[in-house]
């Protein structure tokens, strides 16, 4: 969490930001808010990012003023309009690209003064893992699918009856290159397993870490899978 | 209230250029993007490009080499001019607002400028 | 370039049945959907943006829904004034492209 004051000026006014990761092809939210105005026609939101002449976004006088945006934001940012008045400036931004990673400040003008504060936005891949019996191999053996990462993330395998014990010798991971030629497909295939076992397939890189949980009995398998996004500080 | 007013003119030659004009009210061309779309029977709709707040372009690729938008702020009006028509360049011929700055649809429309390219 | 499938071409529907139009995007475009209504002799109305969103004074009858290649407009119950060419377009990447249509015929 980063909170900035206004430095300028008699008044000074809180502005919170939240370093975040963005999904390369999907949609981000930077996330920023501060001390509410009753009035919106007094609030200016500036969004500027380092190393880049143009304004991401502007919103005055209660509507969109984006004709300083910088030419690789255009069409590309939004900013919730109807919750602004209520103190939230956060940023809506479309198809994120690797280029978008970098340090964003968040500026605002009110009628009690100015604030602003920076934010880290990190962009990647990063899916949820999946993890199947694989019935067409000769002994038993699981197989972990993520289908889109960036960069390149490490896989680990671990079990619950075997707790530590390092399954890089019995495990092959390999990396696919997908169509866009960026973002990669994991494919994870763990070897003589036992049933009546849990079993996780953990992906991790930078920016995100995703476990896949598969359990084999004789008679059922359950599956778990979960993702979190590493490194969200709050300025 | 939101309006997107055309005007130009509805016979070309072929090889010859196009110009529209779209006058915009209700909003700031400093605060939305204004898109080209075209309509033809054997073609369906066709984007054609966009000439954003800052006065940057995108084009189509496919019209690249013969489209230009520009626009006066001041006055609330957006200029499209495409060069060398030929007869399959025939179609209504649209300007069009976004619904957010985001480009999530096409919520504003001209009402359209019927072109026939024909000696 | 993203192309836009739409099905059926046409359909021939009473007045109260259920309607349900289908466009695939041939690559994944998030939920960057549009679906237009345009009558003869008019320009294109939106009707629902961002895959779900109705736009503004839309009837509550007309419903969309879908994510990455898959969208459907459904309306719930059809009205003789529903009688139209309907078309799905993506804005997710340039070029933005859009569905040859589906005619709506009320029967």
């Known amino acids: 969490l980063i909170i900035g004051f206004g430095i300028s000026g008699r008044h000074s006014i809180t502005v919170t930001t939240v370093a975040s990761a963005g999904n390369i092809g999907e949609d981000g939210i930077l996330s920023c808010t501060f001390e509410p105005d009753i009035k919106l026609s007094d609030i200016v939101i500036q969004w500027l990012k380092e190393g880049v002449i143009g304004l991401v976004h502007e919103f005055k006088e209660g509507k969109d003023e984006l004709s300083e945006q910088d030419e690789m934001f255009r069409g590309r940012t939004a900013v919730f309009a109807d919750q602004v008045i209520v103190g939230n400036a956060s940023l809506r931004l479309k198809n994120v690209q690797l280029t978008d990673a970098g340090t964003y400040k968040c500026y605002i003008i009110t009628s009690k003064g100015k604030g602003n504060a920076n934010l880290e936005y990190k962009t990647g891949a990063f899916s949820m893992p999946e993890v199947n019996v694989d019935y067409n191999a000769s002994s038993e053996t699981l197989r972990c699918e993520a289908p889109r990462w960036f960069p390149q993330p490490t896989v680990v395998w671990a079990s619950q009856v075997d707790q530590g014990a390092n399954f890089s010798e019995v495990s092959n991971t390999s990396f696919e290159l997908n169509s866009e030629n960026v973002t990669m497909k994991v494919v994870s295939v763990l070897y003589n397993v036992t049933i009546n076992n849990t079993y996780s397939c953990m992906i991790e890189n930078d920016i995100a870490k995703a476990t896949g949980d598969i359990k084999v009995t004789e008679s059922e398998i359950k599956r778990r899978s979960h993702l979190q996004l590493l490194n969200s500080k709050a300025s | 209230q939101i309006q997107l007013q055309q005007s130009g003119p509805g016979l070309v030659q072929p090889s010859q250029s196009l110009s529209i004009t779209c006058t915009v009210s209700g909003f700031s061309l400093t605060s939305y993007g204004v898109q080209w779309i075209r309509q033809s029977p054997g073609k369906g709709l066709e984007w054609l490009g966009v000439i954003w707040s800052s006065g940057s372009t995108d084009y189509n690729a496919a019209f690249l080499s013969r489209l230009s938008f520009s626009k006066d702020n001041s006055k609330s009006q957006v200029f499209f001019q495409m060069n060398s028509l030929q007869a399959d360049d025939s179609a209504i011929y649209y300007c069009?607002?976004?619904?957010?700055?985001?480009?999530?649809?096409?919520?504003?429309w001209g009402q359209g400028t019927l072109v026939t390219v024909s000696a | 370039n993203i192309v836009m499938t739409q099905s059926p071409k046409s359909m021939s529907m009473s007045v109260g049945e259920r309607v349900t139009l289908s466009c695939k995007a041939s690559e994944k475009v998030g939920t960057y959907v549009s679906w237009y209504q345009q009558k003869p002799e008019q320009s294109p109305k939106l009707l629902i943006y961002?895959?779900?969103n109705r736009y503004t004074g839309v009837p509550d009858r007309f419903t969309g829904s879908g994510s990455a290649t898959d969208f459907t407009l459904t309306i719930s119950s059809v009205q003789v004034e529903d009688l139209a060419d309907y078309h799905c377009?993506?804005?997710?990447?340039?070029?933005?492209?859009f569905g040859s249509g589906t005619k709506l015929e009320i029967k």
């Open positions: 961002g895959a779900s």
């Open positions: 069009a607002r976004d619904v957010t700055t985001i480009v999530e649809g096409f919520a504003h």
């Open positions: 377009g993506q804005t997710y990447s340039y070029p933005f492209t």
